[in-house]
């Protein structure tokens, strides 16, 4: 009769669990949009804003050719437990001004949190190993100011956006060569 | 705000060459890839090229290869576009995009190329 | 001859929708994402659908995109007199190892 109902298949087709990562990162890609978009609204920020503590870009235009599957899901997944680590203290550190979008900014972690199980998950069924951060965590103090907290949820937002953006045109690369 | 502001066009003879700039502001350029793109008059959108973030990676459209140089200086913000052996066909309005994945999200005004004798 | 086909022409009145379509191969649009964007005279192009079918934002829902296959759509729901300009479907193609376009649809509202 084939396993319980809930239960997770032992063996799966990679190019579907790919799909299926693909239409969560695209999902969470376009909620990231909708936010950084609200917040631009709220808080126009002047000029463009950077936090040491985000993860450096991993793809671009001219890593494309060498991709490979092990080495993307690894990174990505590293980037991404970096970026919910940012939001989570966004919610806790944000301050006043940051709580008008708490409920996007919590329903934007629960995606975040949904996106990096799949991914866990993806990586389990290709047999990948689950690596650890090989860059130290940086722990996130308080902002210096409200306005610092402004800055900073610019910032990840972007930094969130730009990541999900290639690492669609990345995973949708690698189905292809699966 | 994000904008891109694209100058060096003009007027050049066959076999001349131009250097194209393009200025970027409100956003931090050493993150993204940059691309030219042209639009001969009243034709249609054609890709250039593209540089990654950091530069040490350029791609360029068949019919540029050798001719046309993709660079950029982040300490500056801008992107530049060295053009040599300039054709008739080469003529254009010239784009700077950014890219932050598959598409361009924001284009400049575009800056226009005449090559002619 | 561009890689990317599109209809050169499209019209249709205020309110109506409008589909422009766009075909390609396996090496383009069967591989990569489809992304289409907006020309109103006299201007610079502007991003309308990425992903094949993600709005930017600041573009009304009305624009929507679509992929199946090889081929691609863009549909226009409610038409407007502002919705008249070239609109142009793109795409990464992995035989070409560059970005193509499709030859542009120029949309007028009658």
């Known amino acids: 009769p084939g396993p319980p109902a809930g239960s997770p298949r032992v063996s799966s087709d990679p190019r579907a669990d790919l799909d299926s990562a693909v239409l969560l990162t695209r999902s969470l890609l376009a909620d990231t949009r909708q936010l950084a978009a609200q917040m631009r609204d709220k808080f126009p920020a002047d000029g463009d804003h950077s936090l040491d503590s985000l993860p450096t870009l991993a793809m671009s235009a001219g890593t494309l050719g060498s991709l490979q599957l092990p080495g993307v899901l690894t990174r990505l997944r590293v980037d991404l437990m970096s970026y919910l680590r940012h939001v989570q203290w966004l919610r806790r550190a944000g301050g006043p001004s940051l709580k008008t979008l708490e409920p996007e900014l919590g329903a934007l972690q629960a995606r975040l949190e949904r996106l990096l199980r799949r991914l866990q998950l993806l990586m389990s069924r290709l047999a990948l190993p689950q690596a650890a951060p090989d860059q130290p965590v940086i722990p996130l103090g308080p902002p210096a100011s409200a306005w610092g907290s402004i800055r900073a949820a610019h910032a990840i937002l972007g930094g969130l956006h730009l990541t999900l953006d290639w690492a669609v045109r990345g995973l949708l690369l690698l189905k292809t060569r699966l | 705000e994000v904008q891109l502001l694209e100058s060096g066009g003009g007027l050049v003879q066959p076999g001349g060459s131009l250097r194209l700039s393009c200025a970027a502001s409100?956003?931090?350029?050493?993150?993204?890839?940059m691309n030219w793109l042209r639009q001969a008059p009243g034709k249609g959108l054609e890709w250039v090229g593209v540089?990654?973030?950091?530069?040490?990676?350029?791609f360029y459209a068949d019919f540029v290869k050798g001719r046309f140089t993709i660079s950029r200086d982040n300490s500056k913000n801008t992107l530049y576009l060295q053009m040599n052996s300039l054709r008739a066909e080469d003529t254009a309005v010239y784009y700077c995009?950014?890219?932050?994945?598959?598409?361009?999200?924001?284009w400049g005004q575009g800056t226009l190329v005449t090559v002619s004798s | 001859q561009s890689v990317l086909t599109q209809p050169p022409s499209a019209s249709g009145t205020p309110g109506q929708r409008v589909t422009i379509s766009c075909s390609g191969s396996s090496s383009n649009i069967g591989n990569n994402a489809v992304n289409w964007y907006q020309q109103l005279p006299g201007t610079a192009p502007k991003l309308l659908i990425y992903?094949?079918?993600l709005l930017p934002s600041g573009v009304p829902d009305r624009f929507s995109g679509s992929k199946s296959g090889t081929s691609a759509s863009l549909a226009i729901s409610g038409l407007r007199s502002e919705d008249e300009a070239d609109y142009y479907c793109s795409a990464w193609d992995d035989s070409l190892n560059g970005v193509v376009f499709g030859g542009g649809t120029k949309l007028t509202v009658l």
């Open positions: 409100g956003f931090t350029f050493s993150h993204y890839d």
């Open positions: 995009a950014r890219t932050p994945g598959s598409h361009f999200d924001y």
């Open positions: 540089i990654s973030y950091e530069g040490s990676n350029k």
């Open positions: 992903y094949d079918d």
